[in-house]
C-alpha cells in the first residue's frame, strides 16, 4: 500500500476517541510499555507518547478492568461483568473456540479389526448447559490449551455416577510434564479444583467406557469450566442474556429468575407477560401452551379429626400451562372427601386422627397398640403400606435430568393404597424418593454371626406403567456416602415384590429414582407414564415400629423375666422359651430360631460350623461303592485361585476379559475369594477405602481391562459379582437342589474315577437370574497335575457360563484323587530263596489315588525253602 | 396498534368453494390463538374454528367439520379459512378475531352470501 | 356445549337512563382455583364489527367509560350500564370462555325510545 505525503488536508492531532492503548509485548525482565494505536492508521497524527505499563504479572480483581488511560483497576459497570484474570465457559450450545474433542480406540487387535466399529464418531457432545462424554468403550479427550501470563487455576463441576466410565482430569504444562498421577482420577461428583503454572496448560479431561453387559453406561458431564491467571482484562464484558448485574463491579451476572426474561447487558430482568412464561435464565418468553391432563397430578391431604381425607388436585411445578386457552384444561375440583386409609403397621391412630407410633415393647396392625405377651419381642422395623402422608424418615425431590440441579419439587404424591411419581418439570427428570435408616437391630434373640451377613432386609412391592423408555432404579447409600445402583427396571414391569439385603450395619438410605425418558428433550409428553410402590417393609430397624411379636429366649431376673439372645446355633422352643442346640449337621434359620425346625439339614458332603450359621466342606469327602469307601482329602486346594477367561473384545475393539476367584473348602465355611471394583477405589481419597465396591465368596468374576490397554500402572478391574454365597452340597451326581453341573461341557473323564461336584448357589437375584446364580466346580482326579492343579473353563463358554447365570469350572488336581487305601496296590510275595522270603508292595497302575496311606515298606521275613521239609 | 384485516367475501353458490383470509399486523401474531365468528344476518355471534399457535391445534363447530380448515402462516401474519361444499346457511358475515381467551380484537368481517 | 341465554332480546330507553342485561349460563363459569368468572361482554355497534367491553365479568377494558359494570358470579351475570349515551345504542353479547366451544348469548339490542 503507498502512502503519499503533501497531498490533501493536513493530519489533525488525534481526539481520545480516534486510538485506544495497547501493552507491548514483555521484555525479558517483566516489564511493557503502554502504546497508543490508532483505530484507522494514518488518520491523525500526535499520539500521546508510550509511558511505562504495570508489571506483566499485574493483574485486576474480579468485578474490574484495567482502564488503560490512567492504568488503573475501575469497577465494571451495571449490566457487565468481568472475570479478572480469568475465562468462563458456561454455554455448551457448540464446543467453545479453543476446545478440541479427540477420540481413540484403546487397543483394537489386528485379528478383529474387521468387526470394529471406528471411533472417529465418539467425542464429548456440547448440551447446552454441560457438555456429555462419550459412553462407548472409546477414549474421548476434551482438551483445552491456555497460555497464563501468571499462576492461576482451573476450576470446573462435574457429574461422574457411573463407575463402568473412566474418568480422568489432567493438564500438561510447558515442560510436556502431566499433573501427578494419582490425582488425575477424578472422585464422584463434585467440583474439580487443580491449580495451574504460569506459561503453556494443556487441560484434558479424558473418558473411557467399558460396559461389557451391554449397558450402557451414564455419561460423565462437565460445566462452569473457569480458568484463572490468562491475562488482564482492559474491558468488561455485558451481561448475557437471561443474565443480569444490578450492581457495580460484578464477577458475574445472576440468572433472570422464572418468568423473567432479559437482553444482552441488562442491570435487571423483565417480567413475563401474563399469557407467557419462561424458565431460569431466558432471554425471552414463550407463550404458554394450553393446559392439558398431563399439567396436574392428585393427591391426598393428611387426615382431619374426623378421620376423612380429601382428594386434592394441583398443578405441576413450574405451571406454565395455560388453563384459559382454548382446548385447555382446568384444574378438577378438589375437595371430595373419603374415610382414611388405616395407619400403617406398628403405628396407632390419635384422636385428632393422626397415626403415631406404638411404644417399643408393643405391636399394632394399624388401630391399637397391644403389648407384646410374655416370652416374645417386638420384630421391629418399618411397613409402609398406606400412604396417606409421606412417613417422617421418607422425603421426596425432583432431580433435574437436563442440569442435574436439585429442583426443589415433589418427585412422588401419596394416593392411599400407592405412592407415584409426580408430574415432572420435564420428562427427563428424576423423580426421587429416599427412605432413611438410621441403623439396624437384629433381634436380641439372634447372635451376631460374622459369615451369614445378613443384618436386615428391604422388600417392596412396585409397578411401572410406561409408553417409551422409562426407568426405575433403586439404589443403595451407606453412612451418607453416594447411593449406589442395586437394580434397574427398564419400561413397563407388572406389580412384582423385590427384596433386598442388608449386610451392614449403618445409616442406609434407599432410593427409588423413575425417570419417564432418558431423552435429552424438556417438555412433559409422557406425564401419564408412572411407578408406584405399593409397600415397603424394611426388618430389624433401629427405633423401628413392631406389627407382630416373636418368640424369645427367657432368663430370669429380679425383675421377672426378660429376653435374652441364646447362644449361637440355638433356637428357642417357643412353649418354654428355653434355649437348644441345634443337632449335628444342621444350621439355623437367620433370624427366625423358632422351633427345632428353624435348624436345616445341611446338603450332602457339608457339616455345619461351630456356631450353625452355614454349611460347608471341610475339605474330605467320602463317597460310597459297594465294594468300598473312597475318601478324599482336598486341603491342598483349600486357598483361593484365580483363574481369566479368554479375552474377549467389545464392539469397539475394547480388549477385556473375565477373572475368577475361588475358594473350595475349609476355614470354617468362611468366604476367602474377593473381588474388587478398582475404577471405584481409583476415585477414592485416601482413608476411604470402605467406599470401595469389593465382593467376598465363594466364587467371584471381575471384569478387568489389562494395564497395556489403559496405559495405567494396574490393569482396571470392575462390576464385581457373586457367584457363590452359599454350599449347597458335594456329590458326585450330575444334579443338586435344582442346580445342574453338565458333565459335556468338559472333556470326559477318562479314569473311570467319578468327578466330584461342589454345588453352589449366590444370593444375587436379579432380573436376568430370576433364581440368582449358581455355580458348580467340578474336582476331577488327574495324577498328572501336581496340587493345586489346573482350573479350566467349559470350552464352548469360555466365560464360565453359557446362561449369564449358570457358571461351571473343572478343577484337575491329583489332589481330586481319593485317599490311598490298601486297595490302591498289589502285594507281592517272593519264592523263599536261601531261608529268606521277600514281600513288595506296588501301587496298582495306573495310580489313581494320592496321600492317604503310604505303600508300605518290603518285608523280608525268615522262611524254610520246600526242600527243608522234604528232607 | 392491533389490527386485523379480511379479504373479499363475495357471492357464492351452494357446494362450491371459498377462501377468506386476514391480514394481522400490529402484534407478534404467533403469539396468539385466532378464530373465525360468523354472524348470520339479524342473528347472534357464533364461532366457527379455532387454530393454535401453530397447526398443531385446531377445533371446529360441529356443522362445520370436514368442509372448513382454518390454517394459518406465522411468517407473514395471516390466517386463512378455506371453506368447502358451502351450504346456504353458511351465508355469514365472517370475522377473524384474536383469541387469547376471550377474542379481544376483531376484523371489520366479511360478507358470504351462498345462493343459488 | 355451554348455552347462553340473555335476557331481554331488546331494549328500547331514553338517554340518561340506566339499563340491566342479564345473562345466564347453563353451568357455572366460576373457576375456583383462580376465583374468576369466564364471561366477556361485547359491544356491536350498527354496521361494526364486536368491541370487548368487559372480561372475567367484571373487568372493563381500557377505555372503555366507567358507566358500564358488570357483576354476577357463577351461572347469573349482569351488564348495567349507568346514564345511557347515544353512542351506547347497540347490540350486547355475553360470551363464556370457560370452555371450548366458546359460545355467545343470542343478543340484547338497546334502543333509543
Known amino acids: 500500500f503507498q502512502v503519499t505525503l503533501g497531498t490533501g488536508p493536513e493530519l489533525h492531532a488525534c481526539k481520545e476517541s480516534e486510538y485506544h492503548f495497547e501493552y507491548t509485548a514483555c521484555d525479558s525482565t517483566g516489564s511493557r510499555w503502554r502504546v497508543a494505536v490508532p483505530h484507522s492508521p494514518g488518520l491523525c497524527t500526535s499520539l500521546p507518547d508510550p509511558v511505562k505499563g504495570t508489571e506483566c504479572s499485574f493483574s485486576c480483581n474480579a468485578g474490574e478492568f484495567l482502564d488503560m488511560k490512567d492504568q488503573s483497576c475501575k469497577p465494571c459497570a451495571e449490566g457487565r461483568y468481568s472475570l479478572g484474570t480469568g475465562i468462563r465457559f458456561d454455554e455448551w450450545d457448540e464446543l467453545p473456540h479453543g476446545f478440541a474433542s479427540l477420540s481413540a480406540n484403546l487397543e483394537v487387535d489386528d485379528s478383529i479389526s474387521e468387526s470394529t466399529e471406528n471411533c472417529t464418531s465418539s467425542k464429548w457432545v456440547p448440551r447446552g448447559d454441560y457438555i456429555a462424554s462419550n459412553t462407548d468403550e472409546c477414549t474421548a479427550t476434551l482438551m483445552y490449551a491456555v497460555n497464563l501470563k501468571q499462576s492461576g487455576t482451573v476450576n470446573f463441576e462435574y457429574y461422574y455416577p457411573d463407575s463402568s466410565i473412566i474418568f480422568e482430569f489432567f493438564v500438561q504444562n510447558d515442560q510436556c510434564q502431566p499433573s501427578a498421577d494419582d490425582s488425575r482420577w477424578m472422585k464422584t461428583t463434585e467440583k474439580g479444583w487443580v491449580e495451574l503454572n504460569r506459561g503453556n496448560n494443556v487441560l484434558y479431561w479424558r473418558t473411557t467406557a467399558f460396559s461389557v453387559w451391554s449397558k450402557v453406561s451414564k455419561p460423565v458431564l462437565v460445566r462452569n469450566i473457569a480458568i484463572t491467571g490468562v491475562a488482564y482484562t482492559s474491558e468488561c464484558f455485558p451481561c448475557k442474556p437471561g443474565t443480569y448485574a444490578a450492581k457495580q463491579g460484578s464477577p458475574f451476572c445472576k440468572l433472570c429468575p422464572a418468568n423473567y426474561y432479559s437482553n444482552k447487558g441488562e442491570t435487571s430482568c423483565h417480567p413475563c407477560d401474563a399469557d407467557k412464561y419462561s424458565e431460569k435464565g431466558s432471554s425471552t418468553c414463550k407463550v404458554r401452551p394450553a393446559c392439558t391432563d398431563k399439567d396436574y397430578f392428585y393427591t391426598h391431604t393428611a387426615c382431619d379429626a374426623q378421620g376423612e381425607t380429601q382428594l386434592m388436585y394441583k398443578w405441576a411445578i413450574p405451571k406454565i400451562c395455560g388453563e384459559d386457552l382454548e382446548g385447555a384444561v382446568k384444574l378438577p375440583a378438589s375437595g371430595v372427601k373419603t374415610r382414611c386409609p388405616p395407619c400403617n403397621p406398628g403405628f396407632f391412630k390419635t384422636d385428632n386422627s393422626t397415626c403415631e407410633p406404638c411404644p417399643y415393647g408393643s405391636y399394632s396392625n394399624g388401630s391399637d397398640c397391644t403389648h407384646c405377651p410374655a416370652g416374645t419381642e417386638p420384630a421391629v422395623g418399618f411397613e409402609y403400606k398406606w400412604w396417606n402422608t409421606l412417613p417422617s424418615n421418607m422425603e421426596t425431590t425432583v432431580l433435574s435430568g437436563i442440569n442435574f440441579e436439585y429442583k426443589g419439587l415433589t418427585g412422588w404424591e401419596v394416593a392411599g393404597d400407592h405412592i407415584y411419581t409426580a408430574v415432572g418439570a420435564s420428562d427427563n427428570d428424576f423423580m426421587i424418593l429416599t427412605l432413611v435408616v438410621p441403623g439396624f437391630r437384629p433381634p436380641q434373640s439372634v447372635v451376631a454371626d460374622t459369615e451369614n451377613k445378613e443384618v436386615a432386609r428391604i422388600t417392596f412391592v412396585f409397578e411401572t406403567i410406561c409408553s417409551v423408555n422409562c426407568e426405575l432404579y433403586f439404589m443403595v447409600g451407606m453412612n451418607s456416602r453416594t447411593n449406589t445402583p442395586v437394580e434397574t427396571w427398564k419400561g413397563t414391569k407388572g406389580k412384582q415384590s423385590y427384596t433386598y439385603t442388608i449386610e451392614e450395619n449403618a445409616t442406609v438410605s434407599f432410593t427409588w429414582a423413575f425417570q419417564r425418558t432418558t431423552l435429552h428433550e424438556t417438555g412433559r409428553k409422557y406425564t401419564n407414564d408412572v411407578a408406584k410402590i405399593y409397600s415397603i417393609n424394611v426388618t430389624n430397624v433401629m427405633g423401628g415400629v413392631a406389627s407382630y411379636c416373636r418368640p424369645c429366649a427367657l432368663e430370669a431376673s429380679d425383675l421377672g423375666s426378660s429376653c435374652t439372645s441364646c447362644p449361637a446355633g440355638h433356637y428357642i422352643n417357643r412353649d418354654s422359651g428355653t434355649c437348644h442346640l441345634c443337632p449335628s449337621n444342621t444350621i439355623l434359620k437367620a433370624h427366625q430360631p423358632y422351633g427345632a425346625q428353624a435348624c436345616v439339614p445341611c446338603g450332602p458332603g457339608t457339616k455345619n460350623n461351630k456356631i450353625h450359621s452355614l454349611c460347608y466342606n471341610d475339605c474330605t469327602f467320602s463317597r460310597n461303592t459297594p465294594s468300598r469307601i473312597f475318601n478324599y482329602n482336598f486341603s491342598a486346594l483349600a486357598g483361593t485361585v484365580s483363574l481369566a477367561g479368554v479375552p474377549s473384545f467389545t464392539s469397539k475393539g475394547l480388549k477385556y476379559f473375565h477373572h475368577f476367584t475361588l475358594s473350595l473348602c475349609g476355614n470354617q465355611g468362611k468366604k476367602m475369594a474377593v473381588c474388587t471394583d478398582n475404577v471405584t477405589d481409583l476415585r477414592i481419597p485416601d482413608g476411604e477405602a470402605g467406599f470401595s465396591k469389593s465382593v467376598t465368596a465363594y466364587v467371584c468374576q471381575v471384569v478387568i481391562i489389562p494395564s497395556e490397554v489403559m496405559g495405567y500402572k494396574a490393569g482396571v478391574s470392575s462390576q464385581p459379582v457373586s457367584l457363590a454365597d452359599r454350599l449347597v452340597g458335594v456329590s458326585t451326581d450330575m444334579t443338586l437342589e435344582g442346580i445342574v453341573s453338565p458333565v459335556e461341557l468338559f472333556h470326559p473323564e477318562t479314569s473311570g474315577i467319578p468327578d466330584i461336584v461342589f454345588f453352589f448357589r449366590s444370593n444375587d437375584v436379579t432380573q436376568s437370574c430370576s433364581s440368582g446364580r449358581s455355580t458348580t466346580i467340578r474336582l476331577r482326579c488327574n495324577p498328572m497335575k501336581a496340587a493345586p492343579g489346573t482350573l479350566r473353563l467349559p470350552s464352548m463358554c469360555s466365560d464360565g457360563t453359557c446362561d449369564g447365570c449358570n457358571f461351571h469350572f473343572l478343577w484337575e488336581s491329583v489332589a481330586a484323587c481319593p485317599l490311598c487305601s490298601a486297595s490302591d496296590y498289589h502285594t507281592f510275595v517272593s519264592s523263599c530263596v536261601a531261608g529268606i522270603q521277600k514281600t513288595t508292595y506296588m501301587w496298582r497302575e495306573p495310580k489313581l489315588c494320592s496321600g492317604g496311606i503310604s505303600l508300605p515298606e518290603q518285608r523280608v521275613t525268615i522262611c524254610k525253602t520246600i526242600d527243608f521239609w522234604l528232607k | 396498534e392491533v389490527q386485523l384485516v379480511e379479504s373479499d367475501g363475495g357471492f357464492v353458490q351452494p357446494g362450491r368453494s371459498l377462501t377468506l383470509s386476514c391480514a394481522a399486523s400490529?402484534?407478534?401474531?404467533?403469539?396468539?390463538?385466532m378464530s373465525w365468528v360468523r354472524q348470520a344476518p339479524t342473528k347472534g355471534l357464533e364461532w366457527v374454528a379455532t387454530?393454535?399457535?401453530?397447526?398443531?391445534?385446531?377445533n371446529y363447530r360441529d356443522s362445520v367439520k370436514g368442509r372448513f380448515t382454518i390454517s394459518r402462516d406465522n411468517a407473514k401474519s395471516i390466517l386463512s379459512l378455506q371453506m368447502d361444499s358451502l351450504r346456504s346457511e353458511d351465508t355469514a358475515t365472517y370475522y377473524c378475531?384474536?383469541?387469547?381467551?376471550?377474542?379481544?380484537?376483531w376484523g371489520q368481517g366479511v360478507m358470504v352470501t351462498v345462493s343459488s | 356445549d355451554i348455552v347462553m341465554t340473555q335476557s331481554p332480546s331488546s331494549l328500547a330507553v331514553s338517554a340518561g337512563e340506566t339499563v340491566t342485561i342479564n345473562c345466564k349460563s347453563s353451568?357455572?363459569?366460576?373457576?375456583?382455583?383462580?376465583?374468576?368468572?369466564?364471561l366477556a361482554w361485547l359491544q356491536q355497534k350498527p354496521g361494526q364489527s364486536p368491541k370487548l367491553l368487559i372480561t372475567?365479568?367484571?373487568t372493563r377494558q381500557s377505555g372503555v367509560p366507567d358507566r358500564f359494570i358488570g357483576s354476577g358470579s357463577g351461572t347469573d351475570f349482569t351488564l348495567t350500564i349507568s346514564s345511557v349515551q347515544a353512542e351506547d345504542l347497540a347490540i350486547y353479547h355475553c360470551?363464556?370462555?370457560?370452555?371450548?366451544?366458546?359460545?355467545f348469548g343470542g343478543g340484547t339490542q338497546l334502543e333509543l325510545k
Open positions: 378475531a384474536r383469541h387469547p381467551s376471550y377474542f379481544d380484537y
Open positions: 400490529g402484534f407478534t401474531f404467533s403469539d396468539y390463538y
Open positions: 387454530i393454535g399457535y401453530d397447526v398443531s391445534y385446531t
Open positions: 353451568q357455572s363459569l366460576f373457576y375456583s382455583e383462580n376465583q374468576k368468572n369466564y
Open positions: 372475567w365479568a367484571s
Open positions: 360470551q363464556q370462555y370457560y370452555d371450548t366451544p366458546r359460545t
